[in-house]
Interface confidence: low
């Protein structure tokens, strides 16, 4: 177990052009606070994945009012460290997100007026017990300077806070089976630390913080003997040797208290003593209130103003999670039809439609030919959100406005010569060929492969293409 500590040194405009406007004004004074979110490992986790190592909110900073005309200075910061306790081993590599929030002042009865100013993130290696590490991160035009460290809570030591150490009982050496605690050679590796007060004679533990009783003893600290005379012990299977009940599973076995709460047995059940910040039968409810600003991304906090009334965050569209910390990728549902481009604007979804489609979700297929005239006798053909013109002979182009050169495509086969004509083209065929495009050879015996030529035309004459 241990604590990750974060010290914010400054938050203000970064170097370079484009200094940000002050987030506070004479009309709207405000103050800053910070949120840190820690995750184990160096993986590129999404910003919305849970803060598995823990999270913390700072206190509110002093009230700040912008001086008119003055550039935004470094803004006044909250006092103190942000502390994120961790119960298990320190992972050594971790990801962090630090958010700078603005609280607008006023009687916010109807809901919070908080807005996210900047979010920085990074991945770092850090050994517990080491010195403070300094860092500078930029978010847009803002710059955040901070230091951080991880320290173990006694009796844990080591770079991962997994070894338990105690001062030596004897000056020269550690007890039987116990090694010195490097690098603290004056301390010794300690045996497992049972729950405070656990009877050394009648109790033992297999996990730190527990207290399991030897046969014949009961109670949260194994200090209560099981009666062998009246045999009225309220629980446990009967012992064949004594004919009496011996302690079976107790209500505190397995520690039903969450979030570091300690369990004590009561005549009927158990009772959890919760650490500060938690409450509920099993310490399962965070004592954070709306005053602590637990809802992010413009979420609305509702619930009582006192820790006995749990809060709930109402998330704006595009966000979800118990604290509105998760961004919903609403475009992944592919709401835009007909190939429209989806834009998630945060407050709304927008679809940018392809030509020929319209509507909030591009669901309407427009009449592509509506209002589109094809010139020179061309006809409009719809298709796939675009129109095209099928042009009359002798015309071309998108709207049939261009005069076509009918000979440009070399339409006359077998060396025939092409002549442009007001109604199209005429092919003058080379000897031995005939047809509108000179496509048919004339048989050597003088007969054509076609039916007889119309009157007045001999094979080999120019065939006019109508």
């Amino acid at each position: 177990a241990g604590v990750f500590e974060l010290q914010i040194h400054s938050f203000g405009p970064g170097p370079g052009p484009g200094a940000p406007r002050s987030p506070c004004s004479a009309r709207l004074p405000c103050r800053l606070f910070f949120r840190v979110c820690l995750k184990p490992g160096l993986s590129e986790e999404a910003a919305e994945s849970p803060c598995a190592l823990g999270a913390a909110l700072s206190a509110r900073g002093p009230v700040y009012t912008e001086q008119p005309g003055a550039p935004a200075p470094d803004l006044p910061l909250p006092d103190g460290l942000l502390q994120v306790p961790f119960r298990d081993a320190w992972p050594g590599t971790f990801s962090f997100i630090i958010e700078t929030w603005r609280e607008e002042l006023g009687d916010q009865i109807g809901g919070p007026a908080w807005s996210l100013l900047a979010r920085v993130a990074g991945r770092r290696r850090l050994a517990a017990g080491g010195p403070w590490a300094r860092d500078i991160q930029r978010a847009g035009a803002w710059e955040l300077r901070f230091s951080y460290r991880a320290r173990c809570e006694p009796p844990a030591v080591g770079t991962a806070c997994t070894r338990l150490c105690r001062p030596r009982s004897a000056p020269s050496r550690c007890g039987p089976g116990l090694r010195p605690c490097a690098p603290l050679e004056d301390e010794c590796e300690a045996p497992l630390v049972c729950r405070a007060g656990c009877s050394p004679e009648h109790g033992f533990c297999e996990q730190p913080g527990e207290c399991r009783c030897l046969e014949g003893w009961t109670g949260p600290l194994c200090t209560v003997p099981v009666s062998t005379s009246s045999c009225l012990s309220p629980r446990g299977p009967s012992s064949a040797t004594t004919g009496c009940l011996v302690p079976g599973p107790g209500p505190c076995d397995g520690n039903p208290c969450a979030n570091g709460g300690s369990c004590s047995e009561t005549p009927r059940s158990f009772e959890c003593t919760c650490p500060r910040g938690f409450y509920g039968l099993r310490c399962e409810v965070s004592g954070v209130t709306c005053a602590d600003g637990p809802c992010f991304n413009g979420g609305l906090c509702v619930g009582g103003a006192d820790p006995d009334s749990a809060y709930i965050c109402h998330c704006p569209p595009g966000f979800q999670g118990s604290n509105c910390e998760k961004r919903v990728d609403r475009c992944s549902l592919q709401p835009c039809r007909n190939g429209g481009l989806c834009l998630d604007l945060g407050h709304a979804l927008r679809c940018r439609c392809r030509a020929g489609f319209a509507g909030p979700r591009c669901e309407h297929d427009l009449d592509d030919c509506a209002g589109r005239a094809c010139a020179n006798g061309g006809t409009c053909v719809e298709g796939g959100g675009a129109h095209r013109c099928s042009c009359a002979l002798g015309f071309g182009g998108r709207d049939c406005r261009e005069r076509a050169d009918p000979c440009a495509a070399r339409p006359c086969a077998h060396g025939g010569r092409c002549y442009a004509h007001f109604s199209g083209l005429v092919c003058a065929c080379a000897p031995g060929y005939m047809g509108a495009r000179c496509e048919f050879p004339v048989h050597p015996d003088g007969a054509s492969a076609l039916p007889a030529a119309p009157p007045g035309l001999r094979p080999g004459d120019p065939q006019r293409y109508l």
């Epitope: 607008e104 006023g106 009865i109 998330c315 704006p316």
Partner: antibody
Framework: QVQLQQPGAELVKPGTSVKLSCEAS????????MQWVRQRPGQGLEWIGM????????NYNENFQTKATLTVDKSSSTAYMQLSSLTSEDSAVYYC???????????WGQGTSVTVSS | DIQMTQTTSSLSVSLGDRVTINCSAS??????LNWYQQKPDGTVKLLIY???NLHSGVPSRFSGSGSGTDYSLTISNLEPEDIATYYC?????????FGGGTKLEIK
């Protein structure tokens, strides 16, 4: 005392827009969310959306996202809802309501009856 | 979206009756439930917030209870001015939704 004043009725043509108003008095307008609720004839209540005047933050029911636009004028302590591309389906009574703690709408306007008809 | 269901759309009642109106949610809403009264002239008033808390100025004959998905509004001694339609509304997540309403009618 807290009051929310809404005009009694609006008659509008299909395809047009209408901007409904809700004038607040008796409390600090900027600090409370203003909610809007629809009630079609003979039907129940439907939540449209909400706006927090001091920051212009809005939250919409997605069913109304393209239909309604919420705005405020802090100088006159008035909330507005614009309804666009009106059809007969939009004929209804539209209420504004102040939201207090626990997301409870503790004070309601009298409602504006919108009739869409050519 | 969470559906709120008021199974009884109308109730025939007598003055002095003890009346219970039920409301069920399609999923747990953690007591995030309010009750409203709508008079025949369209006027809407808040009665109960957060399942069981009486709004200021509301007579003590109104009470609310419930948990999980099932909630109820009770009027212990029905008065003439209580003839109205009653709506439940959840606020456990967006969008807020209302029940379909329960209309009280004199027998």
């Amino acid at each position: 005392q807290v009051q929310l004043q809404q005009p009694g009725a609006e008659l509008v043509k299909p395809g047009t827009s209408v901007k409904l108003s809700c004038e607040a008095s008796g409390y600090t307008f900027s600090n409370y969310w203003m909610q809007w609720v629809r009630q079609r004839p003979g039907q129940g209540l439907e939540w449209i959306g909400m706006i927090l005047p001091n920051s212009d933050i809005t939250n919409y029911n997605e069913n109304f996202q393209t239909k309604a636009t919420l705005t405020v004028d802090k100088s006159s302590s008035t909330a507005y809802m614009q309804l666009s591309s009106l059809t007969s389906e939009d004929s209804a009574v539209y209420y504004c309501a102040r939201q207090a703690r626990y997301s409870a709408m503790d004070y309601w306007g009298q409602g504006t009856s919108v009739t869409v008809s050519s | 979206d969470i559906q709120m269901t008021q199974t009884t759309s109308s109730l025939s009642v007598s003055l002095g009756d003890r009346v219970t109106i039920n409301c069920s949610a399609s999923q747990g809403i953690s007591n995030y439930l309010n009750w409203y009264q709508q008079k025949p002239d369209g006027t809407v008033k808040l009665l109960i917030y957060y399942t069981s808390n009486l709004h200021s100025g509301v007579p003590s004959r109104f009470s609310g209870s419930g948990s999980g998905t099932d909630y109820s509004l009770t009027i212990s001694n029905l008065e003439p001015e209580d003839i109205a339609t009653y709506y439940c509304q959840h606020y456990s997540k967006f969008p807020y939704t209302f029940g379909g309403g329960t209309k009280l009618e004199i027998k």
